[in-house]
Amino acid sequence: KKVVLGKKGDTVELTCTASQKKSIQFHWKNSNQIKILGNQGSFLTKGPSKLNDRADSRRSLWDQGNFPLIIKNLKIEDSDTYICEVEDQKEEVQLLVFGLTANSDTHLLQGQSLTLTLESPPGSSPSVQCRSPRGKNIQGGKTLSVSQLELQDSGTWTCTVLQNQKKVEFKIDIVVLAFQKASSIVYKKEGEQVEFSFPLAFTVEKLTGSGELWWQAERASSSKSWITFDLKNKEVSVKRVTQDPKLQMGKKLPLHLTLPQALPQYAGSGNLTLALEAKTGKLHQEVNLVVMRATQLQKNLTCEVWGPTSPKLMLSLKLENKEAKVSKREKAVWVLNPEAGMWQCLLSDSGQVLLESNIKVLPTWSTPVQP
């Protein structure tokens, strides 16, 4: 008996061939001997089976002695033995229909679990192997689970179902809902405008939810909510914003926040959370702000940074075009009695400058100028 595997929702074509290459009488029946379809001369007629409105044939092939049974929009319960009666012969085909579905939704938050469930006909014993977009293989029986989904798991999962040495392939598109970056850091000189951007790593037709930015300033003992907002069909509307700082928010995606001035009291780290409609859990992105200030007070030239800097960052003070006068893995450096000229304060990581502030030191009888 020939075995054919089908996919739920798909169309399958079961073949039946006569030795005579001409149109002759044929009938397709199910295992209960109920007629599905057949012909009367060149006319296709149907029987009272449950497949009635989903069964078809190809009349153009009859003259070649081929009498296929086409079943559209396959259901698991279509799994059966189908019998083609032609030329006093009976050809039997066993059809096994499988379905593979993702738990509840194919749009999942980063860190959530993905469960793939195989629907199979009674009496079958299939095995399943799935390959993720990043090449990870998972195997199982009726269910397969992947915990802690990552951004790289977004894309097409290819799953192969094996039964009776035959295989059928399913493709399931999974979207991992996350921000493009888990964390970002912004370096600014005191007084500069600060732009925070929170691009999403996915696109959907309609995006609705609500979000909030909590901020932990380095100088503050506790965190506070800087802004809350709503998202409706990709349109952003601010619900509440603190008076200090007075943040501004873009009306369109990607989520975009503007801090009018970088000040030492704002330096610190924030956590933007986004709760999406009909999803349990939230999306998170950490954002850090490092602020630099260079000052000269009497005979002391000082450079300071505030905010979350890593211990390997180097803070330096140097006169333009000269070697660094002072370089330390600290958050403040100074030079006593600096020479006149343009001084540079540099925050760097392995030689790469992250932040630079210039200050002009005038001869001692003048006051310093900060460009």
């Epitope: 001369g41 060149s42 007629t45 149907k46 190809r58 009349r59």
Partner: antibody, heavy 123, light 107 residues
Amino acid sequence: QVQLVQSGAEVKKPGASVKVSCKASGYTFTDYYLHWVRQAPGQGLEWMGIIDPSGGSTSIAQKFQGRVTMTRDTSTSTVYMELSSLRSEDTAVYYCATTAYYDFWSGYSMDVWGKGTTVTVSS
Amino acid sequence: DIQMTQSPSSLSASVGDRVTITCRASQGVGNDLAWYQQKPGKAPKLLIYAASTLQTGVPSRFSGSGSGTDFTLTISSLQPEDFATYYCQQASSFPLTFGPGTKVDIK
């Protein structure tokens, strides 16, 4: 547009035969099946049979088998229905009607009808 | 052969009324069912095929539903030109068979 023009009314004696024609126009003749349906005075519709103009094969309702012959002439795009051994109960309006032919299933609903031919059987 | 029954056999209604006619097949025909309208002295006119698909040019007040053995033709708001006899027909297997008809006349 698709049109079916039927032959004129006929008066026949019992035992005689009648041949009704149905000329098709406005489409490719072999692209549509043709049915014959009759309606006795004050009665409902009764399907008599179908012809496939492309090959000429027919399927006739059992009630009419042996008495009905359906033929076609592709050169004139005309289908004929001949009913023999006429009896008084064959008095009716005879309609031809089309079903578009597709490679795949479309069901046998009849979308275009002729105006009908009245056949009266009376001694 | 598949027997087709229709109910009611006749009904009286007024312009603007909602009219429902039912058709039952003696065995399953999937969605292979057609509805026709016939006026005295005229050929039948196809209204609906495949149980629920409106034939081109037929007003949207006509609708069809059902599958398997039970089918319905609905006229949402009866118009003067809708007074006629309505037939259902199974379009699934030979011999093709029609229902006995439902005559809709003016109340």
